[in-house]
């Protein structure tokens, strides 16, 4: 069964910077990746970025840079302009549209006790949805 993993990292050098890493574990090729925050895409979440393997990326503030890391994983750098660091308590969700399997989504957040530079383990969290 395909799975999606999500990691959220706080950058050690810049406490206002976060990076979301997402990956797809399964067969098929990725046709689209959607990253959202505050909940799953289309279910209360707000889009941060959409990545297409050939056409490029679309991203919205506070996303700073969305990019492919491998053919089945992406990273999204976020710039937190607020002093209160709202990202620390935010859920980030990644939805992978895989051809021809369908869509798979998983969500994750920064662990409550995270020190700068530490990240959530690269394992799927319970919010996993297949369309």
């Amino acid at each position: 069964t395909p799975e999606v993993w999500v990691q959220v990292q706080m950058e050690a050098t810049e406490l206002s910077s976060f990076t979301v890493h997402c990956g797809f574990l399964g067969p098929g090729s990725i046709s689209l990746v959607t990253v959202s925050w505050g909940g799953p895409d289309g279910a209360g979440g707000t889009k941060l970025a959409v990545l297409h393997p050939e056409l490029g990326t679309r991203q919205w503030a506070p996303a700073r840079q969305a990019r492919w890391e491998t053919q089945s994983s992406i990273s999204l750098a976020l710039e937190d302009s607020g002093a209160s660091s709202p990202f620390a308590n935010t859920t980030f969700c990644c939805k992978f549209a895989s051809f021809p399997e369908g869509s798979w989504e998983s969500c994750g957040s920064l662990p409550p006790s995270s020190d700068p530079g530490l990240s959530a383990p690269p394992t799927p969290v319970p919010i996993l949805r297949a369309d």
Epitope: S29, S31, L32, V50, H52, E54, L55, R58, F99
Partner: antibody
Framework: QVQLVQSGAEVKKPGASVKVSCQAS????????IYWVRQAPGQGLEWMGW????????NYAQKFQGRVTMTRDTSISTAYIELSRLRSDDTAVYYC???????????WGQGTTVTVSS | DIQMTQSPSSLSASVGDRVTITCRAS??????LGWYQQKPGKAPKRLIY???SLQSGVPSRFSGSGSGTEFTLTISSLQPEDFATYYC?????????FGGGTKVEIK
Amino acid sequence: QVQLVQSGAEVKKPGASVKVSCQASGYTFTDYYIYWVRQAPGQGLEWMGWINPNSGGTNYAQKFQGRVTMTRDTSISTAYIELSRLRSDDTAVYYCAREDNFNGMDVWGQGTTVTVSS
Amino acid sequence: DIQMTQSPSSLSASVGDRVTITCRASQGIRNDLGWYQQKPGKAPKRLIYAASSLQSGVPSRFSGSGSGTEFTLTISSLQPEDFATYYCLQLNSYPLTFGGGTKVEIK
């Protein structure tokens, strides 16, 4: 409601330039790319390129490289396409359309007829 | 560039008929395909995106299927307002390319 309103018809002579505008309303202009598509009389649809209204970045179809310029003015939520060195075969209806995050165009302008004739 | 070959280029049908239009891509495009309807003097209107997802507000008699290189638009029961020209569009790589169109006329 979400809409794109384009400027009026233009008649130009060969060798001249034309600039068509596309004003967006009902949504945040900088959140969606704008595509430009044209259609010659009795012919099919032809994609010309896009502009990112947020950054001003562009991507033009190879066929139009060097002759086309896409710009935007975020203060008035308007995108523009300028085509230079016009030829008679540039006579067409020019459409702007909103890109739906790689899923094609979900909202279209009404079209602007550009006629190139001596 | 990816070529999109649409067939037939025109067809005559009656109200209530089932109509099928096909689009073939010159190389695999996964499900990166949309279908558009255009009436004379009007801008195109999106019917289907991602090969099989129905655009909000579009009647359920329209459906899309296919993946890779072969795609189909089906109108299950043709209505008077469906007489128009239909285009497929590949959204897999730049430049985006349209099929040549299929004109659906009244028999």
